[in-house]
Amino acid sequence: FERTRSLQDPCSNCPAGTFCDNNRNQICSPCPPNSFSSAGGQRTCDICRQCKGVFRTRKECSSTSNAECDCTPGFHCLGAGCSMCEQDCKQGQELTKKGCKDCCFGTFNDQKRGICRPWTNCSLDGKSVLVNGTKERDVVCGPSPADLSPGASSVTPPAPAREPGHSPQ
């Protein structure tokens, strides 16, 4: 089949990194600068991706493979192949239409990306709050109040590292 295809289509002999040049009697010509072909038999080369602005080059373009971008420090990739760069925020914040904003009271974000999420409601699981939540950390749920009744083995909660986060907007 390959042999038959080659006889029918001379372009099928052109390897990756070249294109079948119709202007030159279907000779295999190397891809011009800043372009590539990742498969054989191509009639054109694709333009290399350019990593500009907040995008930085992770892998240079070659004649056979496209450039790969990631994000400059302070940003992180979104989408397939890092098609977008989103600004980081600090822990305890989320990215809003007004930039990075502190999590509202009762919510937290322990990452530099994503949204503030509500603290766990310990009482829904019949438990009590062992360590208060902050803007950066979820609450820690402890034993249920019934488990702490007189006679039951008591748990001394560790002192919270800081006051509960409070950031009314």
Partner: nanobody, 122 residues
């Protein structure tokens, strides 16, 4: 060919004012959302301000009330009026298209200028 060319940067004393311009060509400026970003020496890139084609504006908290983004569609030009400048505003300022329409988020297909240096120092 798309081009974004920033100008208007320079050395300015604290408390002073500057107006940055970004001349756009090669695309339909009037229907494009645009933004400014900056990078201070040794610091990370930071989104500064964005403007929709409608004229709606957004600013990072640290420049709110001091910087004003605007556009002149007849001149295909984006502006950043900067006043009450502080030492911490020292950076290279970049003009860019803003296809995501999401604050602090840029797409790989966005275009960027080469930047203009703003130095705030006495």
């Amino acid at each position: 060919e798309v081009q974004l060319v920033e100008s208007g940067g320079g050395l300015i004393q604290p408390g002073g004012s500057l107006r940055l311009s970004c001349a756009a060509s090669g695309f339909t400026f009037s229907s494009s959302a645009m933004s400014w970003a900056r990078q201070a020496p040794g610091k990370e890139f930071e989104w500064v301000s964005s403007i929709y084609s409608s004229g709606k504006t957004y600013y990072v908290e640290s420049v709110k009330g001091r910087f004003t983004i605007s556009r002149d569609n007849a001149k295909n030009t984006l502006y950043l009026q900067m006043s009450s400048l502080r030492a911490e505003d020292t950076a290279v300022y970049y003009c860019a298209t803003w296809k995501t329409l999401r604050v602090g988020v840029w797409d790989e297909s966005d275009y960027w200028g080469q930047g203009t240096q703003v130095t705030v120092s006495s």
